[in-house]
Each structure stands twice: as C-alpha cells, then as structure tokens.
C-alpha cells in the first residue's frame, strides 16, 4: 500500500539527518550544486540539481527519495526557473538548508 | 505594546482547585496557539499545555493530564487554566505564553507573561 | 516521551566563546528553540527553527542542530549573558512541547 505523504516526508527528513550526521569527509568530494528556490515546487527542484551529481552513494536514497515527491521526470541537466540564478553551493550546505526547509513543511502539514 | 498579563495565583490545600487567568493585548490573539509553562522553585521550565489558536483542541502534559484544562475566550481575549485535585508537586510560577499556530504546534513561544505564583500547600 | 539532555552548567570567561548542547535521538529532524532565562524573569527566546535569531537578539547568538546534538553557540561573551538557557522541541508522536533540563551559564 502506498505510503502516507506525512511518512514519507517524515522518512525523507530523518535521510536527510543521517546524511549531514555522517558527514566524516566532504559530501559528495565537496560537489556543487545549484542553489534552488525554497518557496515553491521544492522537491522537483532539489531533485534536479542534486540529479547532476553522480556517483555519490550518500545522496543515492536522497534523490529516490525526491523522486517520489516529484510529479514528472526529473533527468541531469535539466532546470526549472526555481533555479537561484548563477548561484552554486556545496552539497553539504544545500543538504542542510532542504533539511530546515522541510522540517518548516511538515510542521506547516505540506507533506506534498 | 503586546503584553500577556497573567493573574489568579495565591496559597490553595491540596486537593482544592484555582483557575489562573491570562489576559492578552496588542496582538491578534485568535491568530495564535496558547500555552501554560510553569516553572517550581529552583527547577527548570516545564510544558503544562496548548490549546489551538480557534480552541479546538488541547494537549497537557501527562503530569496535569485529567487535572488541569486550559480554555479561552477569544472575543475577550483571555486564556484560562483551570486547575483541579491540586498536590504539593503543581507549586510553581506560572507562565503564559504564545506561539503562532502551525498545523502542528511546534512554533517557539515569542511572548510570554511574566509569571504568577502558585503555592500548594496544606 | 521525549528526553531532551542538557548540561547543567557552563563557564566561561568573557569575551570567549561559549557552547550550550542539547541531545535528543534524532534531534536533527526536529525544530530546536532555545531562551534565556535570567533570575526572577520570564525566559526570552533568543534562537527559532534550530538557527534562525529573533531581531532584537545580538548577532552573537548562533544555534545549529545535526544528527543527535542542537548546539547553542554565544560568542564573545558578556557578564550580561548569564542566566539559565532552555532547549525545546514539539514531539510530534506525543503532541507535547518538550524543554531539555536547562543549563546555568556562568561568566567567570
């Protein structure tokens, strides 16, 4: 049966934790990503800048993860306007301002 | 200025009841959830309980749970803890305090009053 | 319920830097907020939403929240910083507020 969208919103948050917990060496080699506005359309847009990172196992279930959040495919080089112009950060810092971000979300009861 | 004024507190025997009152101004008060803390002497703050910014729903804490009821009027905007079968271990000050109102309550309380003390004892 | 862990006492000296825990399983999926009380004051919030800072609240009051630990960092402390700070969260399985233990922060 199909997962509730509070669970797995929830499941997605606790990744996230364990990822920025686990941090021992940079993540992902320091990787950049395109920064993303927060406001709107969230987790297609945090899929498709963390899809352009490759072999990365750590973020591997992450972007699973947001796969099943996002309505339509998602593949490497693509861009929606939600993209901050211009503007890159490293993974671990995109990690931890998603992670805030959807912590406010769930408290806020928009788990889709 | 936005304020939140609390009063009813005093001496009251174990076993009896008191209702303390928490009088709200300069703010929306029907915008925001409410709370109780209070705090026994010499110890930390402790959660007594929330009621949702329309009233329509409450939780406490398992210490206060079946005891005490926190109610408001949001016309006269007010919030009230009525607190019944009071033992020695409910002595404490008493703060109100409020939080913008979530689907869940977990906002931080930005307001809070500045306390009155309650003293069980026989 | 929801066990928040907080040292009981910190000392600094001022103008260093002075670092406030708060441990709880998995405190990193939750929101982390934290006041100040000092003696015979209602507390004060000084950290919202694990790092975000109120207005009136110096720019030397930092919080972060990772895995099990909230951290509340004041740096280049001042004598007027002494008080109690409290950590809190909404456990959401119990729907009850929970605050960690407190910690009285001394300037030496």
């Known amino acids: 049966s199909p997962v509730p969208p509070s669970t797995a919103l929830k499941e997605l948050i606790e990744e996230l934790v364990n990822i920025t917990q686990n941090q021992k060496a940079p993540l992902c080699n320091g990787s950049m990503v395109w920064s993303i506005n927060l406001t709107a359309g969230v987790y297609c847009a945090a899929l498709e800048s963390l899809i352009n990172v490759s072999g990365c196992s750590a973020i591997e279930k992450t972007q699973r993860m947001l796969n099943g959040f996002c309505p339509h495919k998602v593949s490497a080089g693509q861009f929606s306007s939600l993209r901050v112009r211009d503007t890159k950060i490293e993974v671990a810092q995109f990690v931890k301002d998603l992670l805030v971000h959807l912590k406010k979300l769930f408290r806020e009861g928009q788990f889709n | 200025q936005m304020q939140l004024v609390e009063s009813g507190g005093g001496v009251v025997q174990p076993g009896r009841s008191l209702t303390l009152s928490c009088a709200a101004s300069?703010?929306?008060?029907?915008?925001?959830?409410m709370h109780w803390v209070r705090q026994a002497p010499g110890k930390g703050l402790e959660w007594v309980g929330v009621?949702?910014?329309?009233?329509?729903?409450?939780h406490y804490a398992d210490s206060v749970k079946g005891r005490f009821t926190i109610t408001r009027d949001n016309s006269k905007n007010t919030l009230n803890l009525q607190m019944n079968s009071l033992r020695v271990e409910d002595t404490a000050v008493y703060y109100c305090?409020?939080?913008?109102?979530?689907?869940?309550?977990?906002?931080?309380?930005?307001?809070w009053g500045q306390g009155t003390m309650v003293t069980v004892s026989s | 319920s929801y066990i928040l862990t907080q040292p009981p006492s910190v000392s600094v000296a001022p103008g260093q830097t002075a670092t406030i825990t708060c441990g709880g399983n998995?405190?990193?999926?939750?929101?982390v907020h934290w006041y100040q009380q000092k003696p015979g004051q209602a507390p004060v919030l000084v950290i919202y939403?694990?790092?975000d800072r109120p207005s009136r609240i110096p720019e030397r009051f930092s919080g972060s929240n990772i895995g099990n630990t909230a951290t509340l960092t004041i740096s280049d402390v001042e004598e007027g910083d002494e008080a109690d700070y409290y950590c809190?969260?909404?456990?959401?399985?119990?729907?009850?507020?929970?605050f960690g233990g407190g910690t009285k922060l001394t300037v030496l």
């Open positions: 305090a409020r939080a913008p109102q979530w689907y869940l309550t977990a906002e931080a309380f930005d307001l």
């Open positions: 300069g703010f929306e008060f029907r915008t925001y959830g």
């Open positions: 009621i949702w910014d329309d009233g329509s729903n409450t």
């Open positions: 998995l405190i990193g999926a939750k929101l």
């Open positions: 939403d694990d790092s």
């Open positions: 809190q969260v909404w456990d959401y399985s119990s729907d009850h507020m929970v």
